[in-house]
């Protein structure tokens, strides 16, 4: 005989959940036990069926999950799986919130990415930090130079994709430049896109040959000679 | 070719439901967000809702909140509209507009591709 | 919402010459990223709305160079500098900043 426990935790780890009204929201609870355990969900501490929402709740036992289709305000509160047997119970809690904000492209916060100059063999860091009211994915670009021309006939730039990433609003995407070389010098942009649209800006990386350390002793004795 | 076509639109009585389709080709369609815009007769454009590349992601209109709901199938490149409770207010030609890439784009981000729009009238 | 008014209602021109249609945003349209998100179509008889101008004042491809767009925050023109006959239509401001997305209440453009 075994207590319950979780068997994807990795799965839960994220505990709010901050969604556009009209979204679908599900909330899982994967566990096993011996004997097998039972789910039932409390909401805000309240056993929790559904019979007074719009549109009911969808209970999938064999999956562990609670399913509330085109969720509205009322729906905001913290949500407990519950999953117990003969030798035990665990609980965890989801905390929802339901955005009624105007929904816009996403900001991307002034200055960053920040114009940045590295020496050849250092790393390099550029920040990008997004605020979205939808879930933001975030591309990192390198504009690129081909036969020559930073442009294409069409006007447009030429571009290589260095990163996707999907995020959460409002966190710090970073962009890792390891062992930096001249080449890695030039214009890098982070663009941000959710449902409404795309949000760019730019920043270059300016890389600097080696420090001569003959040269770099020698140089506070030069600024004072004649 | 960049393509979309609508269809599912017919004459329905008020209270009814209808599902609008929006068969998509000629682009990667799970890599864009898409959008349904309705125009009445003699009217202009109203935008209805939006759904994210993935379908994670949804906006409606006020005017159309509770009552339809967008949604799509990657898997047959089609974007869903289901309209129920639909009221005389509802009368109006549907059409499917692609919305803003995953990724870097060259031109606008969307708002480009329109579709030739489906009639939907409703009538008793 | 965003409130999008487009003035004037109809515009009636001669062939050959100059036409002027203006939108004013309830808000500003001019993002973080400095861009600003208005779009103009144009809507011709029985057809869905064409792109012609995006990002205030991005000719989209295809479009004519007769059509130009400008203005900035709130303040937005869409100018013809030769009406042509197949520039008969109705136009429409767009903001593409924000959801709900909203439109102009557009503009008739006659051939005199």
């Known amino acids: 005989q075994q207590a319950p426990y979780w068997t994807h935790p990795q799965r839960m780890e994220k505990k709010l959940h901050a969604v556009p009204a009209g979204n679908t929201v599900k909330f899982r609870c994967p566990a096993a036990g011996n004997p097998t355990p039972t789910i039932r969900w409390l909401k805000d501490g309240q056993a929790f069926h559904g019979e007074n929402r719009i549109g009911g709740i969808r209970l999938r036992h064999q999956h562990w999950s609670l399913v509330m289709e085109s969720v509205v305000p009322s729906d905001r509160g913290t949500y407990t799986c519950l999953v117990e047997n003969a030798v035990g119970s665990i609980r965890y809690n989801y905390l929802l919130d339901v955005l009624e904000r105007s929904p816009h492209r996403p900001i991307l916060q002034a200055g960053l990415p920040a114009n940045t100059t590295a020496v050849v063999g250092s790393d390099v860091e550029l920040l990008c930090k997004v605020y979205s009211d939808a879930q933001p994915h975030i591309q990192w670009l390198k504009h690129i130079v081909i036969n020559g021309s930073s442009f294409g006939a069409d006007g447009f730039p030429y571009v290589q994709v260095l990163k996707t990433a999907d995020i959460n609003s409002s966190e710090v995407e970073v962009l890792y430049l390891r062992n930096v070389s001249a080449e890695d010098a030039g214009e890098y942009t982070c663009l941000a896109g959710n449902s409404i649209g795309l949000s760019y800006q730019s920043a270059w990386l300016t890389v600097l040959p080696e420090e001569d350390p003959t040269w770099t002793a020698a140089a506070p004795e030069a600024r004072y000679t004649d | 070719e960049v393509q979309l076509v609508e269809s599912g639109g017919g004459v329905v009585q008020p209270g009814r439901s209808l599902r609008l389709s929006c068969a998509a080709s000629?682009?990667?369609?799970?890599?864009?967000?898409m959008h349904w815009v309705r125009q009445a007769p003699g009217k202009g454009l109203e935008w209805v809702a939006v759904?994210?590349?993935?379908?994670?992601?949804?906006y409606y209109a006020d005017s159309v909140k509770g009552r339809f709901t967008i949604s799509r199938d990657n898997s047959k490149n089609t974007l869903y509209l289901q309209m129920n409770s639909l009221r005389a207010e509802d009368t109006a030609i549907y059409y499917c507009?692609?919305?803003?890439?995953?990724?870097?784009?060259?031109?606008?981000?969307?708002?480009?591709?329109w579709g030739q729009g489906t009639m939907v009238t409703v009538s008793s | 919402d965003i409130v999008m008014t487009q003035t004037p209602l109809s515009l009636s021109v001669t062939p050959g010459q100059p036409a002027s249609i203006s939108c004013t945003s309830s808000r500003s349209l001019l993002h973080s990223d400095g861009k600003t998100y208005v779009y103009w179509y144009v809507q011709k008889s029985g057809q869905p709305p064409q792109l012609l101008i995006y990002?205030?004042?991005n000719r989209f491809s295809g479009v004519p160079d007769r059509f130009s767009g400008s203005g900035s925050r709130t303040d937005f023109t869409l100018k013809i500098s030769r009406v042509e006959a197949e520039d008969v239509g109705v136009y429409y401001c767009?903001?593409?900043?924000?959801?709900?997305?909203?439109f102009g209440g557009g503009t008739k453009v006659e051939i005199k």
């Open positions: 507009v692609r919305g803003a890439g995953r990724g870097y784009t060259y031109g606008p981000d969307g708002f480009d591709i």
């Open positions: 000629g682009f990667t369609f799970s890599s864009y967000a």
């Open positions: 767009m903001q593409y900043i924000e959801a709900p997305l909203t």
């Open positions: 759904i994210s590349y993935d379908g994670s992601n949804k």
């Open positions: 990002e205030l004042s």
